[in-house]
């Protein structure tokens, strides 16, 4: 999937299995990624996890799933709220659009995440204060933390790379360079730019994660997905100017943040 | 799991997570650190070598080291100590949530808190 | 719930060939190394191999190598034992474990080499 | 190939008392950096094996904590602080410094 970091770092990640997105004293994030084609070394977001950690009078712990084509209101427990804690409308579950949409707030901790099902996968969307995301304590159980340091060197895509080499072309062409080799012949470069530009006009990385995108599946709800991110970057995002990136970020690994 | 890479990895971000990126300057303490790191999943090889979670340390401290110039001998470094406040603490700090009244947005005595965003889409 | 499932035991002449499988659920599975372990009727357990996340490394025991070979299917979530050239020996309850420390086992499947 | 011992092969133990099992490598399992990979796993009648312990004395989430582990180089031990019915089983000590890995031959505890 494309991450964007707490530092606003943009990069395209093959990581496949369960990885831990955000993990402090407060919160937990997990995602499961799965191969959007089988060969390709291009993953999406199939399986989501949140616990939100017990708190003082406001909060008992709670966890949050979604799967694929299971986007549920309620925590595993049924609850929409935070439990029995005389705070406990300080944690909330929203639903949107159902099936689609979904937003957890969590007031007592100044947290907004917003889960989506775009297609057949998952987005996920987080703004939270810093000093949350610096709340950690027990420095072992941090694992490969990807909002805050992003993903490791070697499991990340250089899908402007691949941008560039495609254009003109259809997807086949490029297969040696593409992340997915069943990538299919039905989607040129020109229909998967005109795709995207009708809902992402500004050619940022969000449209170029569209274009990857479509030219790597020849799944348009990628195009939704794009879309929806940087819907809930602007909703999110507390800085206005940067909703808009331009220069992905190839990083180090553990140096994202 | 019987497999502690993650410790390893946690070890290491954590000797390293004084700044956002190592300046030029750093490169001798950054290194210093990549070896620990390096030396924590040799230990942990034995255990862990046929898991993904090992590789990935293993390829992503090779790369490291190259990017950085690192030699593979030399000093190892001790991973900083960390003293935020636990969840759990019942007193109020300038440092923790706001805990005393949870309906409350996260607003301390005024204070706007630095916001942060990171998200997740697509392939 | 860590699950997996052995399946593809049964009775072989020595000789012949047989192909086991193990079914993992509960856990990603193309996170993992995976171990074959065997044991004879009333005796005690004997590692037979192991293979890496990625199927990269495969090791052996002195007594399978060259006879047995381990692979598996990440997009089945699916562990794989070909024994061939089958011995009165190698008759065994085979099991499979999760990790390279096998933290995890199946149930195991009965492979009996008789004529 | 490594050879580990146990010792005894069968060990009659009395509900509520310790009990003790011997695992003896025939090279050292220790690392040049100090660490030791021999692990513990029980076999109970009519089950598959599950792993106790792991290198050398660090219990496996869902152990009690009446099962400890100890030693160094060849000689290591697994204890049981007070046998209870449920502990019936056999007990493998398994080395995975050197390849191949091997078991030892097991020691069976059964309840006098």
């Known amino acids: 999937p494309h991450l964007r970091t707490f530092t606003d770092r943009f990069q395209t990640c093959k990581v496949q299995g369960a990885w831990p997105l955000i993990d402090n004293n407060y919160l937990n994030v997990q995602v499961t990624n799965t191969p959007v084609l089988p060969g390709s070394a291009a993953t999406a977001t199939s399986k989501l996890t949140i616990i939100f950690k017990n708190f003082q009078e406001c909060v008992d712990q709670k966890v949050y799933q979604a799967e694929m084509d299971e986007l549920p209101a309620a925590f595993v427990d049924g609850s929409k709220n935070g439990g029995d804690k005389h705070g406990a409308n300080s944690l909330k579950i929203t639903e949107k659009v159902s099936g689609q949409h979904v937003e957890i707030r969590a007031k007592y901790i100044g947290t907004t995440i917003v889960v989506r099902q775009v297609g057949r996968y998952l987005t996920f969307a987080v703004r939270v204060p810093e000093e949350v995301v610096n709340a950690v304590e027990d420095w072992d159980s941090q694992g490969l933390y990807l909002c805050l340091r992003g993903c490791p060197l070697n499991q990340q895509i250089d899908f402007q790379a691949f941008h560039t080499n495609t254009e003109g072309t259809g997807a086949r062409r490029l297969a040696a360079a593409s992340p997915a080799p069943t990538a299919p012949e039905t989607f040129p470069y020109e229909t998967a730019v005109a795709k995207c530009k009708e809902k992402l006009p500004v050619e940022d990385l969000y449209y170029q994660a569209c274009v990857f995108d479509l030219l790597t599946t020849g799944d348009v709800n990628f195009t939704l997905a794009a879309y929806y991110a940087l819907e809930d970057v602007k909703m999110l995002h507390s800085n206005k100017d940067k909703l808009h990136l331009y220069e992905r970020t190839r990083d180090l690994p553990g140096r994202a943040a | 799991s019987p497999c502690k890479i993650l410790k390893c990895n946690s070890e290491f971000w954590s000797a390293t997570s004084g700044s956002h990126a190592p300046a030029s300057d750093d490169t001798p303490e950054f290194c210093a650190a990549l070896r620990s790191y390096a030396l924590c999943t040799r230990r942990t090889a034995r255990t862990c070598r046929g898991d993904l979670a090992y590789h990935s340390a293993v390829h992503g401290i090779e790369d490291l080291m190259s990017q950085h110039n690192c030699s593979k001998d030399g000093p190892t470094s001790q991973p900083r100590l960390h003293t935020l406040p636990p969840a759990g603490d019942s007193q109020e700090r300038s440092d923790s949530p706001e805990i005393c009244h949870c309906e409350k947005s996260f607003h301390k005595h005024s204070a706007t808190p630095n916001y942060t965003h990171c998200g997740l889409f697509g392939d | 719930e860590v699950q997996l499932v052995e399946s593809g035991g049964g009775l072989v002449q020595p000789g012949g060939s047989l192909r086991l499988s193990c079914a993992a659920s509960?856990?990603?599975?193309?996170?993992?190394?995976m171990n074959w372990v065997r044991q004879a009727p009333g005796k005690g357990l004997e590692w037979i191999g192991m293979?890496?996340?990625?199927?990269?490394?495969?090791h052996y025991a002195d007594s399978v190598k060259g006879r047995f070979t381990i692979s598996r299917d990440n997009s089945k979530n699916t562990l794989y034992l070909q024994m061939n050239s089958l011995r009165a020996e190698d008759t065994a309850v085979y099991y499979c474990a999760k990790g390279t420390t096998p933290d995890y086992w199946g149930q195991g499947t009965m492979v009996t080499v008789s004529s | 190939d490594v050879v580990l011992t146990q010792s005894p092969l069968s060990l009659p133990v009395t509900l509520g008392q310790p009990a003790s099992i011997s695992c003896r490598s025939s090279q050292s399992l220790e690392e040049s950096d100090g660490y030791t990979f021999l692990h513990w796993f029980q076999q109970r009648p009519g089950q598959s094996p599950r792993l106790l312990i792991y290198e050398v004395s660090t219990r496996f989430s869902g152990v009690p904590d009446r099962f400890s582990g100890s030693g160094s180089g060849t000689d290591f031990t697994l204890k049981i602080s007070r046998v209870e019915a449920e502990d019936v089983g056999v007990y493998y000590c398994f080395q995975a410094t050197h390849d191949p890995l091997t078991f030892g031959q097991g020691t069976k505890l059964e309840i006098k």
């Open positions: 293979i890496y996340y990625d199927s990269s490394e495969k």
């Open positions: 509960g856990f990603t599975f193309s996170n993992y190394g």
